[in-house]
């Protein structure tokens, strides 16, 4: 039975050109994490394998950095980065756990509108 839960950084609103950290944390299970995949829509961004370490997809190498921990750092944000990001934890013996984070990247002109938030 899958007893674990995924906690995420929560949704993030950021400004174009900035950088953000996406993180997930798996709790309430003793299952072993064998691999964590980071995906956006149907695109694979990065893999962190327990044995082989990190692999960043070639198309994201310039703007995606591994960590901290099992998280992912996105740099030089563009409006095109707006979308849903998935952390997919492959575990044994539980199976797969998935967390979801929505990233909203705003043009500077929009970000200023009513801004009383900390903009990453």
């Amino acid at each position: 039975m899958m007893t674990g839960t995924i906690e995420t950084t929560g949704n993030i609103s950021a400004e174009k050109g900035g950088s953000i950290i996406l993180q997930c944390h798996l709790s309430s299970t003793t299952a072993q994490v064998t691999q964590v995949n980071w995906e956006q829509q149907d695109q694979l961004l990065a893999i962190c394998n327990a044995d082989l370490g990190w692999h960043i997809s070639p198309s994201f190498k310039d703007r995606v950095a591994p960590g901290p921990g099992l998280g992912l750092t996105l740099q030089s944000l563009t409006v095109n980065d707006t979308g849903e990001y998935f952390c997919i934890y492959h575990t044994y013996p539980d199976g797969t756990y998935t967390g979801r984070i929505f990233l909203e990247v705003l043009e500077s002109s929009v970000a200023e509108h009513g801004a009383r938030f900390q903009i990453p």
Epitope: N11, S13, N80, R100, V110
Partner: antibody, heavy 117, light 112 residues
Framework: EVQLQQSGPELVKPGASMKISCKAS????????MNWVKQSHGKNLEWIGL????????SYNQKFKGKATFTVDKSSSTAYMELLSLTSEDSAVYYC??????????WGQGTTLTVSS | DVVVTQTPLSLPVSFGDQVSISCRSS???????????LSWYLHKPGQSPQLLIY???NRFSGVPDRFSGSGSGTDFTLKISTIKPEDLGMYYC?????????FGGGTKLEIK
């Protein structure tokens, strides 16, 4: 002035599909997300999901995955939500709403959907 | 999914009253950057819902200052300082920090 103009009420048969439109004006259509909300029984509000008109990225409430599909036509600043395999449970008022920082700033007038044979 | 519980379900008032509506979430609504995406809406009969407050306490443009929001973490409050006839209707809170976004069940503000 920001305006979201939705298509009119619909009466459809069970099993059919239908598409609601939401025409945006008064702002840059691609600069904000477009959200869809369901209101059942005149009370409960449910977030169906959103689409980012800039790149077509979508996010769905899992409850509505396979039920709702979002698209946009940037040339006419119009967002669409198609509802599939309709049942009486889908009878409701559906709203489009412009999103910013995970709140719903401006709402359309609502589209009433009645599913009945 | 994050469960958002709103109280009370119904709030009978007289014009001029001050009232509070509570919204509680099943987990913290602060993201890793310290931003909390909790907003409040008023839905009047025959109209579309309208945004009152976003980010816990920021009044949306054109919203009178008799409306105020407060709270943190999992506990949030909407206060209306002097009830006017145009304030009657259903009030909803919405959390947008976690996927999927979830609404509270609503509070009906009505005349005693």
């Amino acid at each position: 002035e920001v305006q979201l103009q939705q298509s009119g009420p619909e009466l459809v048969k069970p099993g059919a599909s239908m598409k609601i439109s939401c025409k945006a004006s008064g702002y840059s259509f691609t600069g904000y997300t477009m959200n869809w909300v369901k209101q059942s029984h005149g009370k409960n509000l449910e977030w169906i999901g959103l689409i980012n008109p800039y790149n077509g990225a979508t996010s769905y409430n899992q409850k509505f995955k396979g039920k709702a599909t979002f698209t946009v036509d940037k040339s006419s600043s119009t967002a669409y939500m198609e509802l599939l395999s309709l049942t009486s449970e889908d009878s409701a008022v559906y709203y489009c709403a412009r999103g910013l920082r995970f709140s719903l700033e401006y709402w359309g007038q609502g589209t009433t959907l009645t599913v009945s044979s | 999914d994050v469960v958002v519980t709103q109280t009370p379900l119904s709030l009978p008032v007289s014009f001029g009253d001050q009232v509070s509506i509570s919204c509680r979430s099943s987990q913290s609504l602060a993201n890793s950057y310290g931003n909390t995406y909790l907003s409040w809406y008023l839905h009047k009969p025959g109209q579309s819902p309208q945004l009152l407050i976003y980010g816990i306490s920021n009044r949306f443009s054109g919203v009178p200052d008799r409306f105020s929001g407060s709270g943190s973490g999992t506990d949030f409050t909407l206060k209306i300082s002097t009830i006017k006839p145009e304030d009657l209707g259903m009030y909803y809170c919405l959390q947008g920090t976690h996927q999927p976004w979830t609404f509270g069940g609503g509070t009906k503000l009505e005349i005693k």
